[in-house]
């Protein structure tokens, strides 16, 4: 049954909101989709989770959530926020998850984010952010996940990322980024997942991915690349690579020489005509390889060291004979 404490907790539930104990003598408060235009005033100090998403909140006053020192997750997605003032999250010492997606923010709320030392996950996707100030994440030493997709960024906010050495996953997809400069992610040594799909990327610095020593997933799909992304060669832990739906015409010799852990490569919907014979060597984890319409391939690819392929598709090539060793190379 419920303890006396949970009864006290539930008496601190704002009108029309749904509240329940979180199992740790703290309160989960759901005030989503209620047409609220301002924050509820009578929140329990013991609130650990507060969902205010899908309302009509257009502004936050400084210090709108006083003394919610136990609050770990705050959802403000799907409101009409255009600006978040300094002090909006003052006192939220335990805050780990902050969701601000689907608002109308034009800038990262730098001052409001300062000193959120416990923050692990920050969603800023689906806003109108065109500029990320250099020091905007400088106090977020615990940040693990950052969403900046579906905004109006035209370049990688290189300096802003320098302080995020604990970051593990980031998406910059669905922006208007056109170039990735050398060392764009140079300090993100813990990053495992990076999504850059659906941008306008047409060029990559030769060393643009240097420093991403933990990266396992890289998504460059739906961009304007017209050359193979040789910058991936420093990504020794890369497992999943996507660069489909670009304008890449050739895959060079030794294309994946620095990526021996690759399991999946998606590169369909590119006008690939030429593939270096050694391009797919020494990829022992690779399971599927599909090469459609590569009209300039005249020799069967050398699959030395790529011994675990389960599916190989070659269409539209000019291969006239198969090497005798092909059946030895494949399982």
């Amino acid at each position: 049954g419920s303890s006396p404490r949970s009864g006290v907790l539930l008496r601190g539930c704002p009108t029309h909101c749904h509240c329940e104990p979180d199992g740790r003598m703290l309160l989960r408060v759901d005030c989503s989709d209620l047409g609220l235009s301002e924050l509820p005033s009578n929140l329990s100090v013991f609130t650990s989770y507060l969902d205010l998403s899908m309302n009509n909140i257009s502004q936050l006053l400084p210090n709108p959530l006083p003394s919610l020192r136990f609050l770990e997750e705050l959802r403000l997605a799907g409101n009409a926020l255009t600006y978040i003032p300094k002090g909006a999250f003052t006192g939220l010492y335990s805050l780990k998850v902050l969701m601000l997606q689907n608002n109308q923010l034009r800038h990262v709320p730098t001052e409001a984010l300062q000193n959120l030392r416990s923050l692990q996950s920050l969603r800023l996707d689906a806003n109108h952010i065109s500029y990320v100030p250099p020091s905007c994440f400088s106090g977020l030493h615990s940040l693990r996940h950052l969403w900046l997709d579906d905004n109006a960024l035209t370049e990688i906010p290189v300096q802003a990322f320098r302080s995020l050495s604990a970051l593990q996953a980031m998406t910059l997809a669905l922006n208007k980024i056109h170039h990735i400069p050398d060392y764009a992610f140079g300090n993100l040594s813990s990053l495992v997942v990076l999504h850059l799909h659906n941008n306008r990327i047409h060029s990559l610095g030769k060393k643009c991915f240097d420093g991403l020593h933990s990266l396992e997933t890289l998504d460059l799909n739906y961009n304007n690349l017209d050359e193979f992304p040789t910058a991936i060669r420093t990504l020794s832990n890369l497992k999943e690579l996507g660069f489909h739906s670009n304008n890449i015409r050739s895959i060079p010799e030794k294309a994946f020489v620095g990526n021996p852990s690759l399991i999946t490569i998606h590169f369909y919907d590119n006008p690939i005509q030429f593939v270096g014979r050694s391009a797919f060597q020494h990829l022992p984890e690779l399971r599927t390889l599909t090469l459609n319409g590569a009209s300039q391939i005249t020799e069967f690819p050398d699959l030395t060291g790529t011994a675990n392929l389960e599916s190989l598709t070659l269409t539209g090539a000019q291969i006239s004979s198969l090497p005798q060793t092909v059946c030895n190379q494949l399982p």
């Epitope: 990688i156 400069p181 050398d182 764009a184 240097d210 420093t234 020489v257 620095g258």
Partner: antibody, heavy 118, light 111 residues
Framework: EVQLVQSGAEVKKPGASVKVSCKAS????????IEWVRQAPGQGLEWIGE????????DYNEKFKVRATFTSDTSTSTVYLELSSLRSEDTAVYYC???????????WGQGTLVTVSS | DIVMTQSPDSLAVSLGERATINCRAS??????????MHWYQQKPGQPPKLLIY???NLESGVPDRFSGSGSRTDFTLTISSLQAEDVAVYYC?????????FGQGTKVEIK
């Protein structure tokens, strides 16, 4: 522990070639660029170029483009610098170094003295 | 090529006093807010050792009496309180563009 260990000193005649090796250990060999830098006796440091081990990615200082060649052997985690058509002004200590944080040279080999003398 | 010019060429400082070395690049070495300028220390018979990367970031294991500052074309390496073991030649280096270039070096001695 990251280490770069270079081959021993060489004495060469003008017009000859020299091949200096740099064996890396303690990190993922193919994930970092190796830079080559030289230092003439009593002089400053001069960048020769760089190679990403295992790949064909190289960059040469225009001054050395014709005479310098970088190669690598991933099976032994070794990078090589070959310098041809040696002249007396090539007498120098040749260093390999790892391109670390933002391309800064965070680990260096002990250096290889190449003396060119007739 | 970007020319790196250090000043002074040599510097004599009393133990415990501040030593300041300047480095000027012939053109800006800044890109996307990062200054691609690094500082090295070289003692006789040894390879150079990285002290500071990206103009102001202290390399791991380097004493915090060393600091770097500056942007674009003008940079400074400061040793806040000179120790005997700091006697060496100090070099700045840019890797903003090929060919990467070094300053001519500044020799630091004890007065």
């Amino acid at each position: 522990e990251v280490q770069l260990v270079q081959s021993g000193a060489e004495v060469k005649k003008p017009g000859a070639s020299v091949k200096v090796s740099c064996k890396a250990s303690g990190y993922t060999f193919s994930a970092y660029w190796i830079e080559w830098v030289r230092q003439a006796p009593g002089q400053g440091l001069e960048w020769i170029g760089e190679i990403l081990p295992g790949s064909d990615s190289t960059d040469y200082n225009e001054k050395f483009k014709v005479r310098a060649t970088f190669t690598s052997d991933t099976s032994t985690s070794t990078v090589y610098l070959e310098l041809s058509s040696l002249r007396s002004e090539d007498t120098a200590v040749y260093y390999c170094a790892r391109g670390g944080h933002y391309g800064s040279l965070d680990y260096w080999g002990q250096g290889t003295l190449v003396t060119v003398s007739s | 090529d970007i020319v790196m010019t250090q000043s002074p060429d040599s510097l004599a400082v009393s133990l415990g006093e501040r030593a300041t070395i300047n480095c000027r690049a012939s053109e800006s070495v800044d890109n996307y807010g990062n200054s691609f300028m690094h500082w090295y220390q070289q003692k006789p018979g040894q390879p150079p050792k990285l002290l500071i990367y990206l103009a102001s970031n202290l390399e791991s294991g380097v004493p915090d009496r060393f600091s770097g500052s500056g942007s674009r074309t003008d940079f400074t390496l400061t040793i806040s309180s000179l120790q005997a073991e700091d006697v060496a030649v100090y070099y700045c280096q840019q890797n903003y563009e090929d060919p990467f270039t070094f300053g001519q070096g500044t020799k630091v001695e004890i007065k």
